[in-house]
Protein backbone atom coordinates (compact mmCIF):
# COMPACT_ATOMS: atom_id res chain seq x y z
CA UNK A 1 0.00 0.00 0.00
CA UNK A 2 1.19 3.53 -0.84
CA UNK A 3 0.72 5.76 2.24
CA UNK A 4 1.40 9.02 0.34
CA UNK A 5 -2.24 10.19 0.39
CA UNK A 6 -2.97 9.58 4.08
CA UNK A 7 -4.14 12.40 6.33
CA UNK A 8 -0.95 12.52 8.37
CA UNK A 9 -2.17 15.10 10.88
CA UNK A 10 -5.24 13.00 11.73
CA UNK A 11 -3.07 9.91 12.17
CA UNK A 12 -0.70 11.91 14.36
CA UNK A 13 -3.65 13.03 16.49
CA UNK A 14 -4.78 9.40 16.87
CA UNK A 15 -1.27 8.44 17.93
CA UNK A 16 -0.97 11.23 20.49
CA UNK A 17 -4.43 10.66 21.97
CA UNK A 18 -4.47 6.88 22.33
CA UNK A 19 -1.93 4.76 20.46
CA UNK A 20 1.04 6.23 22.36
CA UNK A 21 -0.54 5.31 25.71
CA UNK A 22 -1.19 1.75 24.52
CA UNK A 23 2.43 1.38 23.40
CA UNK A 24 3.57 2.68 26.80
CA UNK A 25 1.29 0.18 28.54
CA UNK A 26 2.64 -2.69 26.42
CA UNK A 27 6.23 -1.72 27.25
CA UNK A 28 5.54 -1.40 30.99
CA UNK A 29 8.40 -2.85 33.00
CA UNK A 30 10.98 -2.56 30.24
CA UNK A 31 14.25 -0.76 30.95
CA UNK A 32 14.71 2.51 29.07
CA UNK A 33 17.96 1.47 27.37
CA UNK A 34 17.23 -2.25 27.04
CA UNK A 35 16.89 -2.16 23.26
CA UNK A 36 18.97 -0.38 20.64
CA UNK A 37 17.05 1.66 18.09
CA UNK A 38 17.84 0.01 14.76
CA UNK A 39 14.80 0.73 12.55
CA UNK A 40 14.46 4.15 10.94
CA UNK A 41 12.29 6.00 8.44
CA UNK A 42 12.92 9.05 6.29
CA UNK A 43 9.49 10.55 5.60
CA UNK A 44 5.90 10.08 6.74
CA UNK A 45 4.77 7.55 4.09
CA UNK A 46 7.96 5.57 4.73
CA UNK A 47 7.34 5.70 8.51
CA UNK A 48 3.81 4.37 8.05
CA UNK A 49 5.11 1.59 5.78
CA UNK A 50 7.59 0.53 8.47
CA UNK A 51 4.97 0.91 11.23
CA UNK A 52 2.52 -1.28 9.32
CA UNK A 53 5.18 -3.90 8.68
CA UNK A 54 6.35 -4.12 12.30
CA UNK A 55 2.82 -4.01 13.69
CA UNK A 56 1.04 -6.49 11.46
CA UNK A 57 3.62 -8.80 9.87
CA UNK A 58 4.56 -11.76 12.10
CA UNK A 59 8.31 -12.05 12.62
CA UNK A 60 10.54 -14.76 14.03
CA UNK A 61 9.96 -14.75 17.77
CA UNK A 62 6.97 -12.39 17.67
CA UNK A 63 3.76 -13.50 16.01
CA UNK A 64 1.26 -11.86 18.31
CA UNK A 65 1.27 -8.04 17.95
CA UNK A 66 -1.70 -7.69 15.59
CA UNK A 67 -4.24 -8.37 18.35
CA UNK A 68 -2.76 -5.86 20.80
CA UNK A 69 -4.75 -2.73 21.59
CA UNK A 70 -2.20 -0.40 19.96
CA UNK A 71 -2.28 -2.53 16.80
CA UNK A 72 -6.05 -2.47 16.54
CA UNK A 73 -6.09 1.31 17.01
CA UNK A 74 -3.30 1.69 14.44
CA UNK A 75 -5.30 -0.38 11.99
CA UNK A 76 -8.43 1.72 12.61
CA UNK A 77 -6.50 4.98 12.12
CA UNK A 78 -4.98 3.78 8.84
CA UNK A 79 -8.36 2.49 7.63
CA UNK A 80 -10.04 5.85 8.35
CA UNK A 81 -7.31 8.27 7.23
CA UNK A 82 -5.61 6.41 4.37
CA UNK A 83 -7.87 6.17 1.28
CA UNK A 84 -8.30 2.59 0.09
CA UNK A 85 -6.17 1.10 2.89
CA UNK A 86 -8.91 -1.12 4.34
CA UNK A 87 -9.57 -2.77 0.98
CA UNK A 88 -5.94 -3.83 0.69
CA UNK A 89 -6.10 -5.43 4.14
CA UNK A 90 -9.06 -7.79 3.65
CA UNK A 91 -6.96 -10.70 2.37
CA UNK A 92 -4.25 -10.05 4.94
CA UNK A 93 -6.81 -10.08 7.76
CA UNK A 94 -8.30 -13.39 6.61
CA UNK A 95 -4.83 -14.92 6.47
CA UNK A 96 -4.07 -13.56 9.93
CA UNK A 97 -7.21 -15.18 11.41
CA UNK A 98 -5.98 -18.59 10.22
CA UNK A 99 -2.60 -18.02 11.91
CA UNK A 100 -3.98 -16.56 15.12
CA UNK A 101 -2.10 -17.82 18.17
CA UNK A 102 -2.52 -17.21 21.88
CA UNK A 103 -1.18 -13.87 23.12
CA UNK A 104 2.38 -14.13 24.47
CA UNK A 105 4.61 -11.17 25.26
CA UNK A 106 8.11 -12.29 24.32
CA UNK A 107 11.33 -10.32 24.61
CA UNK A 108 11.38 -10.20 20.80
CA UNK A 109 7.93 -8.57 20.84
CA UNK A 110 9.09 -6.00 23.38
CA UNK A 111 12.08 -5.21 21.18
CA UNK A 112 9.77 -4.84 18.18
CA UNK A 113 7.43 -2.48 20.05
CA UNK A 114 10.45 -0.47 21.19
CA UNK A 115 11.30 -0.04 17.49
CA UNK A 116 7.67 0.93 16.83
CA UNK A 117 7.92 3.66 19.45
CA UNK A 118 10.95 5.03 17.63
CA UNK A 119 9.14 4.93 14.27
CA UNK A 120 6.08 6.69 15.65
CA UNK A 121 8.33 9.29 17.25
CA UNK A 122 9.90 9.97 13.85
CA UNK A 123 6.49 10.03 12.15
CA UNK A 124 5.40 12.75 14.57
CA UNK A 125 8.31 15.06 13.89
CA UNK A 126 6.85 18.39 12.78
CA UNK A 127 9.49 19.06 10.12
CA UNK A 128 9.57 15.57 8.63
CA UNK A 129 8.90 15.87 4.93
CA UNK A 130 5.79 14.10 3.68
CA UNK A 131 7.12 12.85 0.35
Amino acid sequence: YDFTNCDFEKIKAAYLSTISKDLITYMSGTKSTEFNNTVSCSNRPHCLTEIQSLTFNPTAGCASLAKEMFAMKTKAALAIWCPGYSETQINATQAMKKRRKRKVTTNKCLEQVSQLQGLWRRFNRPLLKQQ
Epitope: S20, K21, I24, T25, M27, S28, G29, T30, K31, S32, T33, E34, F35, N36, N37, T38, S40, S114, Q115, Q117, G118, R121, R122, R125
Partner: antibody
Protein backbone atom coordinates in the same frame (compact mmCIF):
# COMPACT_ATOMS: atom_id res chain seq x y z
CA UNK B 1 29.84 1.06 31.37
CA UNK B 2 27.88 4.14 30.29
CA UNK B 3 29.56 7.44 31.18
CA UNK B 4 28.46 11.01 30.52
CA UNK B 5 31.14 13.60 31.27
CA UNK B 6 30.22 17.28 31.15
CA UNK B 7 32.34 20.40 30.72
CA UNK B 8 33.27 22.67 33.62
CA UNK B 9 31.46 25.53 35.35
CA UNK B 10 30.82 28.79 33.46
CA UNK B 11 30.20 32.39 34.50
CA UNK B 12 28.39 34.54 31.94
CA UNK B 13 27.00 38.07 31.63
CA UNK B 14 23.29 38.68 30.97
CA UNK B 15 22.57 38.62 27.23
CA UNK B 16 25.49 36.31 26.47
CA UNK B 17 25.38 32.66 25.36
CA UNK B 18 26.81 29.54 26.96
CA UNK B 19 27.73 26.20 25.38
CA UNK B 20 27.96 23.12 27.61
CA UNK B 21 29.31 19.78 26.36
CA UNK B 22 28.48 16.19 27.32
CA UNK B 23 30.88 13.48 26.16
CA UNK B 24 29.37 10.00 26.01
CA UNK B 25 31.13 6.64 26.23
CA UNK B 26 30.42 3.00 27.01
CA UNK B 27 27.56 2.45 24.54
CA UNK B 28 26.64 2.84 20.86
CA UNK B 29 26.26 6.62 20.62
CA UNK B 30 23.56 6.60 17.93
CA UNK B 31 21.31 4.08 19.69
CA UNK B 32 19.86 6.35 22.37
CA UNK B 33 18.53 9.86 22.89
CA UNK B 34 20.38 12.54 24.84
CA UNK B 35 18.33 14.94 26.96
CA UNK B 36 19.14 18.09 28.89
CA UNK B 37 17.60 18.87 32.27
CA UNK B 38 18.31 21.95 34.38
CA UNK B 39 17.96 22.74 38.05
CA UNK B 40 18.01 26.29 39.43
CA UNK B 41 19.48 26.69 42.94
CA UNK B 42 17.17 25.09 45.49
CA UNK B 43 14.58 24.37 42.79
CA UNK B 44 13.15 21.36 40.97
CA UNK B 45 14.15 19.71 37.70
CA UNK B 46 13.09 21.09 34.33
CA UNK B 47 13.37 19.14 31.07
CA UNK B 48 14.83 21.33 28.30
CA UNK B 49 14.99 19.13 25.21
CA UNK B 50 16.41 16.06 23.51
CA UNK B 51 18.54 15.19 20.51
CA UNK B 52 18.70 11.99 18.48
CA UNK B 53 22.40 11.53 17.64
CA UNK B 54 21.55 9.23 14.71
CA UNK B 55 20.17 12.14 12.68
CA UNK B 56 20.60 15.23 14.92
CA UNK B 57 16.84 15.71 15.18
CA UNK B 58 15.87 17.83 18.18
CA UNK B 59 12.75 18.36 20.26
CA UNK B 60 12.56 21.21 22.77
CA UNK B 61 10.47 22.18 25.73
CA UNK B 62 8.25 25.06 24.55
CA UNK B 63 9.60 27.18 27.43
CA UNK B 64 13.07 27.18 25.86
CA UNK B 65 12.27 27.07 22.15
CA UNK B 66 14.21 29.75 20.30
CA UNK B 67 16.86 30.07 23.04
CA UNK B 68 18.26 26.56 23.31
CA UNK B 69 20.11 24.64 20.59
CA UNK B 70 21.27 21.05 20.87
CA UNK B 71 23.95 19.77 18.52
CA UNK B 72 26.04 16.64 18.18
CA UNK B 73 29.62 15.90 17.14
CA UNK B 74 29.67 12.29 15.94
CA UNK B 75 33.46 12.15 15.72
CA UNK B 76 33.84 12.67 19.48
CA UNK B 77 30.47 11.26 20.67
CA UNK B 78 29.71 14.62 22.22
CA UNK B 79 26.42 16.48 22.56
CA UNK B 80 26.33 20.25 23.06
CA UNK B 81 23.69 22.45 24.66
CA UNK B 82 23.83 26.15 23.80
CA UNK B 83 21.58 28.61 25.63
CA UNK B 84 21.40 32.16 24.33
CA UNK B 85 20.11 35.51 25.63
CA UNK B 86 21.06 34.52 29.15
CA UNK B 87 19.31 36.12 32.11
CA UNK B 88 19.89 35.81 35.84
CA UNK B 89 17.13 33.19 36.19
CA UNK B 90 19.14 30.88 33.88
CA UNK B 91 21.63 30.41 36.72
CA UNK B 92 21.35 26.66 37.26
CA UNK B 93 23.06 23.30 37.09
CA UNK B 94 22.61 21.80 33.62
CA UNK B 95 22.58 18.01 33.27
CA UNK B 96 22.73 15.74 30.24
CA UNK B 97 20.85 12.46 30.63
CA UNK B 98 20.36 9.37 28.49
CA UNK B 99 17.22 7.46 27.51
CA UNK B 100 16.03 4.89 25.01
CA UNK B 101 12.55 5.13 23.49
CA UNK B 102 11.17 5.14 27.04
CA UNK B 103 11.91 8.51 28.54
CA UNK B 104 13.04 8.08 32.10
CA UNK B 105 16.64 8.87 32.87
CA UNK B 106 18.84 6.05 34.12
CA UNK B 107 22.17 7.73 33.25
CA UNK B 108 23.12 11.33 34.09
CA UNK B 109 26.14 13.56 33.61
CA UNK B 110 27.71 15.08 36.71
CA UNK B 111 26.17 18.50 36.00
CA UNK B 112 27.57 21.87 34.91
CA UNK B 113 26.94 25.01 36.94
CA UNK B 114 26.20 28.06 34.81
CA UNK B 115 26.14 31.36 36.69
CA UNK B 116 24.65 34.42 35.00
CA UNK B 117 25.70 37.60 36.72
CA UNK B 118 26.54 41.16 35.77
CA UNK C 1 1.89 19.76 29.71
CA UNK C 2 1.12 17.28 32.48
CA UNK C 3 1.63 18.78 35.95
CA UNK C 4 2.97 16.65 38.79
CA UNK C 5 2.28 17.71 42.37
CA UNK C 6 4.32 16.14 45.14
CA UNK C 7 3.34 16.10 48.79
CA UNK C 8 4.64 16.90 51.23
CA UNK C 9 7.28 19.40 50.10
CA UNK C 10 9.21 18.88 53.34
CA UNK C 11 9.24 15.85 55.60
CA UNK C 12 11.01 15.38 58.93
CA UNK C 13 11.54 11.80 60.05
CA UNK C 14 13.84 9.64 62.13
CA UNK C 15 16.03 6.66 61.28
CA UNK C 16 13.86 3.55 61.23
CA UNK C 17 10.67 5.43 60.32
CA UNK C 18 8.40 4.42 57.45
CA UNK C 19 7.75 7.37 55.13
CA UNK C 20 5.49 7.84 52.12
CA UNK C 21 5.72 10.54 49.44
CA UNK C 22 2.83 11.14 47.05
CA UNK C 23 2.89 12.34 43.45
CA UNK C 24 -0.35 13.37 41.72
CA UNK C 25 -0.57 13.86 37.95
CA UNK C 26 -2.95 16.34 36.31
CA UNK C 27 -4.03 13.61 33.85
CA UNK C 28 -3.67 9.88 33.32
CA UNK C 29 -0.04 8.82 32.87
CA UNK C 30 -0.72 5.05 32.98
CA UNK C 31 2.26 3.71 34.99
CA UNK C 32 4.88 5.86 33.25
CA UNK C 33 6.33 7.39 36.41
CA UNK C 34 9.88 7.34 37.74
CA UNK C 35 11.28 8.38 41.12
CA UNK C 36 14.73 9.90 41.70
CA UNK C 37 16.82 10.60 44.76
CA UNK C 38 19.12 13.62 44.80
CA UNK C 39 21.75 14.60 47.33
CA UNK C 40 23.27 18.11 47.52
CA UNK C 41 25.76 18.79 44.73
CA UNK C 42 25.03 15.49 42.96
CA UNK C 43 23.03 14.43 39.93
CA UNK C 44 19.68 12.71 40.53
CA UNK C 45 19.79 8.92 40.81
CA UNK C 46 17.03 6.71 39.44
CA UNK C 47 15.26 4.69 42.14
CA UNK C 48 12.00 3.47 40.61
CA UNK C 49 10.66 3.25 37.04
CA UNK C 50 7.29 2.10 35.67
CA UNK C 51 5.82 3.27 39.02
CA UNK C 52 6.94 0.17 40.92
CA UNK C 53 10.11 -1.33 39.44
CA UNK C 54 13.30 -0.88 41.44
CA UNK C 55 16.35 0.20 39.47
CA UNK C 56 19.46 -1.99 39.63
CA UNK C 57 21.17 -1.75 43.02
CA UNK C 58 18.35 0.12 44.77
CA UNK C 59 17.71 -1.32 48.28
CA UNK C 60 14.45 -3.23 48.83
CA UNK C 61 13.31 -0.71 51.47
CA UNK C 62 12.37 1.56 48.55
CA UNK C 63 9.09 0.71 46.85
CA UNK C 64 6.73 2.45 44.46
CA UNK C 65 3.07 1.99 43.65
CA UNK C 66 0.17 3.58 41.81
CA UNK C 67 -1.28 4.02 38.36
CA UNK C 68 -3.32 6.58 36.47
CA UNK C 69 -2.94 9.84 38.38
CA UNK C 70 -1.78 8.91 41.89
CA UNK C 71 1.60 7.45 42.80
CA UNK C 72 3.54 6.83 46.00
CA UNK C 73 7.15 6.24 46.97
CA UNK C 74 7.59 4.43 50.28
CA UNK C 75 10.76 3.94 52.31
CA UNK C 76 9.97 1.16 54.76
CA UNK C 77 12.71 1.84 57.30
CA UNK C 78 14.72 5.04 56.90
CA UNK C 79 18.49 4.76 56.90
CA UNK C 80 20.88 7.70 57.48
CA UNK C 81 21.84 7.75 53.79
CA UNK C 82 18.19 8.18 52.72
CA UNK C 83 17.96 11.80 53.84
CA UNK C 84 17.83 13.61 50.50
CA UNK C 85 15.40 15.21 48.06
CA UNK C 86 13.05 12.99 46.04
CA UNK C 87 11.48 13.81 42.67
CA UNK C 88 8.81 12.05 40.61
CA UNK C 89 8.77 12.30 36.79
CA UNK C 90 6.21 11.34 34.16
CA UNK C 91 7.27 9.99 30.76
CA UNK C 92 3.84 9.18 29.39
CA UNK C 93 3.53 12.39 27.40
CA UNK C 94 5.79 14.92 25.77
CA UNK C 95 6.88 17.33 27.41
CA UNK C 96 8.46 15.23 30.20
CA UNK C 97 7.80 16.81 33.58
CA UNK C 98 8.95 16.48 37.19
CA UNK C 99 7.33 17.05 40.54
CA UNK C 100 8.63 19.97 42.58
CA UNK C 101 10.48 17.65 44.98
CA UNK C 102 10.17 16.43 48.57
CA UNK C 103 13.01 17.22 50.94
CA UNK C 104 13.42 14.51 53.56
CA UNK C 105 15.20 15.80 56.66
CA UNK C 106 16.35 14.25 59.93
CA UNK C 107 13.98 15.02 62.81
Amino acid sequence: QVQLVQSGAEVKKPGASVKVSCKASGYTFTSYLMHWVRQAPGQGLEWMGEIDPSDSYTDYNQNFRGRVTLTVDMSTSTVYMELSSLRSEDTAVYYCALTGTINYFDYWGQGTLVTVSS
Amino acid sequence: DIQLTQSPSFLSASVGDRVTITCKASQDVVTAVAWYQQKPGKAPKLLIYWASMRHTGVPSRFSGSGSGTEFTLTISSLQPEDFATYFCQQYSSFTFTFGQGTKLEIK
